[in-house]
Interface confidence: medium
Amino acid sequence: GSERTCCPVNWVEHERSCYWFSRSGKAWADADNYCRLEDAHLVVVTSWEEQKFVQHHIGPVNTWMGLHDQNGPWKWVDGTDYETGFKNWRPEQPDDWYGHGLGGGEDCAHFTDDGRWNDDVCQRPYRWVCETELDKASQEPPLL
C-alpha cells in the first residue's frame, strides 16, 4: 500500500499521528469499529505529552480510548505493551465494578472529565478518539 503522508480532512495532526475527535457517543465496540473502517484505531496513549494533547481536545467529556480488558489482561488495540506503557488511571481505578446493575464488570477504559482514566461498562455511549500514524502503509491497494 501507499504511505500516508498527511492527515485526512477534519483530522488533527500531532507528532506524526492523525487524530479524529467524535462529537457523538457510541458503545466501545462501535467506536472501535468506526475507527477501523477509517483505517485507524481508537487512540493509544503512549506518553504524558500525548495525554495532554488528547485531553486538550476532548474537554471535560467521557471519551473512549483504545484500551480494554475484555479478554482478561488490559490490552491496547494496536498491540502497545500495557504493563510497561504510560498509564493515567484515577485513584483506585481500574476497579472492574459490578455494582452498576448492567451486568458484568467494567472492561473498557475512557478519559473522564478531568482527563484521568476509568474503566466502565463498554456499552455506555461515550465519545471516542480515532488515531492513525503518518508514514504507515495504508490498506488501499496500489494504483496500477
Epitope: 477534519n10 462529537r23 457517543g25 481536545h57 476532548i58 467529556v61 455511549p125
Partner: antibody
Framework: QVQLVESGGGVVQPGRSLRLSCAAS????????MHWVRQAPGKGLEWVTA????????YYTDSVKGRFTISRDNSKNTLYLQMNSLRAEDTAVYYC??????????????WGQGTLVTVSS | EIVMTQSPATLSVSPGERATLSCRAS??????LAWYQQKPGQAPRLLIH???TRATDVPARFSGFGSGSDFTLTISSLQSEDFAVYSC?????????FGQGTKLEIK
C-alpha cells in the same frame, strides 16, 4: 474576570444581512471554542453555531446552514456571526458563549448579555 | 438529534421548600448534562455540568443527579433569588441540545 459583550443587533428586513460581534476579555480567547446560541421571544435556548479555538472547524444548526457564517479574530479577541438572507424565524436574542473545551463541543461556562435581532418588514 | 424534555413546564414552590426539576433525554447522554439558570432579561448562568458538578460560586443547595437519560436538579431550600427559568443541556451527542426550560415561580 471573564467578559463577553455582544453588539450589532437591530431591526432588519427579511432577506437582508446583519453582522454580530462578540468582544471577549478576561481570558485567553484563542484557547477556547466559542458559540452563538439564540433564544426566540418566550422560547427556550437554541444552539446556532460553533467554532474551534483556531477557527479551523465550524459547525451550524441545519436551519442556518448556507446563510450564517461564524468566524473569529484571535488577534482582536472577537467572535463574529455574519447573518445573510434573514428570515422572520431568526428573530431572537443572540448570545455569545464560551465553551469549556477548545473545540466547542461541551457546555457553556460563560455567556454574554445578548443582542436582539428582529427580522420584520 | 437528541430531544431534551423538561418537566414540569412551571413549578410553584414556597421559599424555604425543596424544588425538584426533571430533564429527560430521548436517548442516553451518559453523564454529559448541564443545567443553567436564567432570570428575566439576563443571560443564562451555568449551574451544573457533568450531571452533578457545581460550577464556580454556585451554592451547595443546588444538586444534580441522574445518568443515562433521566436527570434531576434539586434546590434544597429555595431562596428568593432562585426563582427563575432552569434549562438542561446535553453535550454527549452532536449537536448539543437544550430542554425547553422549567419556570420556577413563588407559590
Amino acid at each position: 474576570q471573564v467578559q463577553l459583550v455582544e453588539s450589532g443587533g437591530g431591526v432588519v428586513q427579511p432577506g437582508r444581512s446583519l453582522r454580530l460581534s462578540c468582544a471577549a476579555s478576561g481570558f485567553t480567547f484563542s484557547s477556547y471554542g466559542m458559540h452563538w446560541v439564540r433564544q426566540a421571544p418566550g422560547k427556550g435556548l437554541e444552539w446556532v453555531t460553533a467554532i474551534w479555538y483556531d477557527g479551523s472547524h465550524k459547525y451550524y444548526t441545519d436551519s442556518v446552514k448556507g446563510r450564517f457564517t461564524i468566524s473569529r479574530d484571535n488577534s482582536k479577541n472577537t467572535l463574529y456571526l455574519q447573518m445573510n438572507s434573514l428570515r422572520a424565524e431568526d428573530t431572537a436574542v443572540y448570545y455569545c458563549a464560551r465553551d469549556r473545551s477548545i473545540v466547542g463541543a461541551t457546555y457553556f461556562d460563560y455567556w454574554g448579555q445578548g443582542t436582539l435581532v428582529t427580522v420584520s418588514s | 438529534e437528541i430531544v431534551m424534555t423538561q418537566s414540569p413546564a412551571t413549578l410553584s414552590v414556597s421559599p424555604g421548600e425543596r424544588a425538584t426539576l426533571s430533564c429527560r433525554a430521548s436517548q442516553s447522554v451518559a453523564s454529559s448534562l448541564a443545567w443553567y439558570q436564567q432570570k428575566p432579561g439576563q443571560a443564562p448562568r451555568l449551574l451544573i455540568h457533568g450531571t452533578s458538578t457545581r460550577a464556580t460560586d454556585v451554592p451547595a443547595r443546588f444538586s444534580g443527579f441522574g445518568s443515562g437519560s433521566d436527570f434531576t436538579l434539586t434546590i434544597s431550600s429555595l431562596q428568593s433569588e432562585d426563582f427563575a427559568v432552569y434549562s438542561c443541556q446535553q453535550y454527549n451527542d452532536w449537536p448539543c441540545s437544550f430542554g425547553q426550560g422549567t419556570k420556577l415561580e413563588i407559590k
